[in-house]
């Protein structure tokens, strides 16, 4: 029985050109995390394998950095990065847990209504 829950950073609105950290945390289970996949829509961004460490997809190597922890840092954001990101935790013996984060990337000139944007 899968008892775990995934907590995420929550949805994020950020400015074009900035960087953000996507993080998920698996709790309420003693299952062993064997691998974490980070995906956007149907694209694989990165894998963190318990034994083999990090692998960043070649098409994202310039703008994606591993960590902190099992999280992922996206840099030099573009409006095209807007979309849903998935952290997929492969665990034993529970199976797969998935967290979801929606990232909205805005042109810096459209900071309307006094929005507080994330540029760490």
């Amino acid at each position: 029985m899968m008892t775990g829950t995934i907590e995420t950073t929550g949805n994020i609105s950020a400015e074009k050109g900035g960087s953000i950290i996507l993080q998920c945390h698996l709790s309420s289970t003693t299952a062993q995390v064997t691998q974490v996949n980070w995906e956007q829509q149907d694209q694989l961004l990165a894998i963190c394998n318990a034994d083999l460490g990090w692998h960043i997809s070649p098409s994202f190597k310039d703008r994606v950095a591993p960590g902190p922890g099992l999280g992922l840092t996206l840099q030099s954001l573009t409006v095209n990065d807007t979309g849903e990101y998935f952290c997929i935790y492969h665990t034993y013996p529970d199976g797969t847990y998935t967290g979801r984060i929606f990232l909205e990337v805005l042109e810096s000139s459209v900071a309307e209504h006094g929005a507080r944007f994330q540029i760490p």
Partner: antibody, heavy 119, light 112 residues
Framework: EVQLQQSGPELVKPGASMKISCKAS????????MNWVKQSHGKNLEWLGL????????SYNQKFTGKATITVDKSSNTTYMELLSLTSEDSAVYYC????????????WGQGTSVTVSS | DVVMTQTPLSLPVSFGDQVSISCRSS???????????LSWYLYKPGQSPHLLIY???NRFSGVPDRFSGSGSGTDFTLKISTIKPEDLGMYYC?????????FGGGTKLEIK
């Protein structure tokens, strides 16, 4: 002036599928998410999902995965939501609503499309 | 999914009253950068819902200043001072911090 014009009411048979449209005007269409909301029994509101026209990125409420499909036609500034394999549970008013940039809220709403599923 | 619980379900008022509507979330609505995506809407039969408050406490354009929002974390409040006839209807809170976005069950503001 921001306007969202939805297609008219629909009466459809159980098991059928249908597509609702939402034509946007008065703003830069590709720069804002378009969301879809279901209102059942004139009361409960449920977020079905969204699309970002700039890159056609979508996000769905998993409760409606396989039930709703959201698409966009940038040439006509129109967003569509297709509802599949309709049952009486899908009878409701469906709204499109523009996302408020930077705040994950819904700032402008269409007039709603009433869908009745009945044999 | 995040559960949004609104209280009360029904709120009988007299014109001129001041009222508060509560919205509680099953988990914190602050994201990792400290932003909280909580908004309030008014729905009147025959109309579409419309935005009143976004980002906890920001009034949307055209919304009278008798509407105010407050709160943090999991506990949020919409206050309406000096109730007017056009304020009657269903009020909903919406969280947009976590996927999927979820609405509260609504609070019906009606005349006593």
């Amino acid at each position: 002036e921001v306007q969202l014009q939805q297609s008219g009411p629909e009466l459809v048979k159980p098991g059928a599928s249908m597509k609702i449209s939402c034509k946007a005007s008065g703003y830069s269409f590709t720069g804002y998410t378009m969301n879809w909301v279901k209102q059942s029994h004139g009361k409960n509101l449920e977020w079905l999902g969204l699309i970002f026209p700039y890159n056609s990125a979508t996000s769905y409420n998993q409760k409606f995965t396989g039930k709703a499909t959201i698409t966009v036609d940038k040439s006509s500034n129109t967003t569509y939501m297709e509802l599949l394999s309709l049952t009486s549970e899908d009878s409701a008013v469906y709204y499109c609503a523009r996302g408020l940039r930077g705040f994950f809220a819904l700032d402008y709403w269409g007039q709603g499309t009433s869908v009745t599923v009945s044999s | 999914d995040v559960v949004m619980t609104q209280t009360p379900l029904s709120l009988p008022v007299s014109f001129g009253d001041q009222v508060s509507i509560s919205c509680r979330s099953s988990q914190s609505l602050a994201n990792s950068y400290g932003n909280t995506y909580l908004s309030w809407y008014l729905y009147k039969p025959g109309q579409s819902p419309h935005l009143l408050i976004y980002g906890i406490s920001n009034r949307f354009s055209g919304v009278p200043d008798r509407f105010s929002g407050s709160g943090s974390g999991t506990d949020f409040t919409l206050k309406i001072s000096t109730i007017k006839p056009e304020d009657l209807g269903m009020y909903y809170c919406l969280q947009g911090t976590h996927q999927p976005w979820t609405f509260g069950g609504g609070t019906k503001l009606e005349i006593k």
